[in-house]
Amino acid sequence: LRPSRVHNSEENTMRALTLKDILNGTFSYKTFFPNWISGQEYLHQSADNNIVLYNIETGQSYTILSNRTMKSVNASNYGLSPDRQFVYLESDYSKLWRYSYTATYYIYDLSNGEFVRGNELPRPIQYLCWSPVGSKLAYVYQNNIYLKQRPGDPPFQITFNGRENKIFNGIPDWVYEEEMLPTKYALWWSPNGKFLAYAEFNDKDIPVIAYSYYGDEQYPRTINIPYPKAGAKNPVVRIFIIDTTYPAYVGPQEVPVPAMIASSDYYFSWLTWVTDERVCLQWLKRVQNVSVLSICDFREDWQTWDCPKTQEHIEESRTGWAGGFFVSRPVFSYDAISYYKIFSDKDGYKHIHYIKDTVENAIQITSGKWEAINIFRVTQDSLFYSSNEFEEYPGRRNIYRISIGSYPPSKKCVTCHLRKERCQYYTASFSDYAKYYALVCYGPGIPISTLHDGRTDQEIKILEENKELENALKNIQLPKEEIKKLEVDEITLWYKMILPPQFDRSKKYPLLIQVYGGPCSQSVRSVFAVNWISYLASKEGMVIALVDGRGTAFQGDKLLYAVYRKLGVYEVEDQITAVRKFIEMGFIDEKRIAIWGWSYGGYVSSLALASGTGLFKCGIAVAPVSSWEYYASVYTERFMGLPTKDDNLEHYKNSTVMARAEYFRNVDYLLIHGTADDNVHFQNSAQIAKALVNAQVDFQAMWYSDQNHGLSGLSTNHLYTHMTHFLKQCFSLSD
């Protein structure tokens, strides 16, 4: 369901989108993800902030925690203990990096309707979670891990060496949080809560990035973050497991690192519990084309963890890096030794494989010139996964069920024909044993969330259909959207074109390219959005195009790994190629073409502007990378190798924006960055600006004081207003 476009009879009542609509979030949508607590029950926070328990079988709902209780501690989040005796209430949320934050936690006792007094939790806490069974608590405070057997008990301190910016226990350091896990936590309960595994990150030898935070004090603060840039010293990681029933008995036991990994710099990439006494760890060489999955067992006699070489599974890429963006995680079957995993097949497409003994003997479960994206759930008789197989559109996601209980296994698309026009991009959330599941459809029509029976796939009810949004859009002239492909030199370039509401092919329109283009990304997706570029098409009459070129994901390894060790070349070439093809279509004013991007997209847009093609009149780079030597080791080296003479230093040097400073002379360039960007440091734009000044090239710039990579809050409004003015001026559009 795409809201109705323009009906001539109603044309006078229809209006274009305004920038204000976008900045106010007038046309934002809601999704509904149940917080599953059993096979047939879930919790959801109601509009009036009560925490409500829904029982699907009986159709009944119950308020288990009132908004009054939530409000009494200004709680913004909650977590029910698995034994349903207690709820933690989270308040004083204070954001740190992308996922991490600190908060104050209160424990509410449901049996007597009172907050637990005595042995209260310290504040602020960096991470807190319940055990999977009962109501044990694990939490991280000041980089150390603590355990409580019951919420009112005194805590047991598990680690003692935690130190700010030096040793992190149970939480990741900056680079592991952003580029490897990527989570705010680094501790994992075993399925029944017998053991607690955790990572320790030692950042003592990592160089520190320091930047000023101006605040409103007389002297700015300096923010210091251990941040390994390409080629720098990396964190040293160790994994420990402790028995939570008798934590003081033998204390934390270290899990051994596979010998072939430990021989040089390495990363830990993920931990998956299989049973209470079997755990699976994934490791990765610093040169990220070799990954090892290691299955370890608890030795009762020695109270240690044994990881036999026979239970080591190696995944290696000969054409690129291991995995997609990350190395995929295993999903274990009920025998607790075999597992399902997504990795490249012999034809270079990511597919589901079943590994019983060795990777070499893996049984391929899915196959074709498309990719399996995510394994949601494996039950005794079914495997649920998502892919972009249907109708050969890589930017779609449908949910499939493979029956693994019967032979040969049969495959069914659960979502392909549900709401075909409205919904072509799904994710799913499953209850215990996949008894029920929620489908969340992101578009291309207005998003809708529905509840389904896990056995029959029958829709039970609509959880959220965004009726208010649908009504609000009834009198809006939304742009038209097309997703098509270009075939160029044996490369398929998928693109999304956003066209003004009264688009006429015989007229000429200004073109704006929006680019991200980072490795394993995808911009051309069949999703709903009413955003800044929707406004530019609807109100300002621009054509906007997004193009997925080489290096992008879900179309096979040939396209994905094309950029390996040479970032900044083909991504840019493919944007330029697409622009030339768009000009050939006849409706683009070739004197009014612009490009813009954020982060990796800012890097690509900068390089495109400095390509010397004369195609672009102007462009914008928001928070761009300018040299890969300035970015994080884990991300950069995955795609570029090391910046050393005997590895890939030459391309590190050749692929900088600064090296092309002279080429900006004939374009209008707007450079934008937040001064407190912890991710792509302000250093990147500072160096571009310096190179442009040294080359005596005129450009425009805007910095956002104390803003990070997201440029949020009031900065967002200022940013989009500023960029709008810049583009309208570039395209000679009146204000």
Epitope: S38, Q40, E41, L53, N55, E57, T58, Q60, Y62, I64, L80, D83, R84, Q85, D109, L110, S111, N112, G113
Partner: nanobody
Framework: QVQLQESGGGLVEAEGSLRLSCAAS????????MGWFRQAPGKSRELVAA???????YYADSVKGRFTISRDNARNTVYLQTNSPKPEDTAVYYC?????????????????WGQGTQVTVSS
Amino acid sequence: QVQLQESGGGLVEAEGSLRLSCAASGRTFGSYAMGWFRQAPGKSRELVAAISSGGTTYYADSVKGRFTISRDNARNTVYLQTNSPKPEDTAVYYCAARTGSAYYTNRIDWPYWGQGTQVTVSS
């Protein structure tokens, strides 16, 4: 172990008054969460109200404001009271008990059950 026996059911007029009782045997009654379930013809058994050992109450949204659950630990009895029954409240009402939290709505999570008492609300 705890044995449960319901009473107080029967025919009642809409907007009349109804009080169900559930007597429990056993000395540790006070440590159990107690619940009232009901099952209408052709429907699954559903939790109507529950009360924790600490006295916190919990109601299905469909009966909230109309039904009241209470317990008397001295008498080893739990009650379900309503002053505004509706025809759709017609069902067999079962008393149930469990150790631990009252916040479970699936019958499988409640190990101890009474025999049930029929309640018919006439319009």
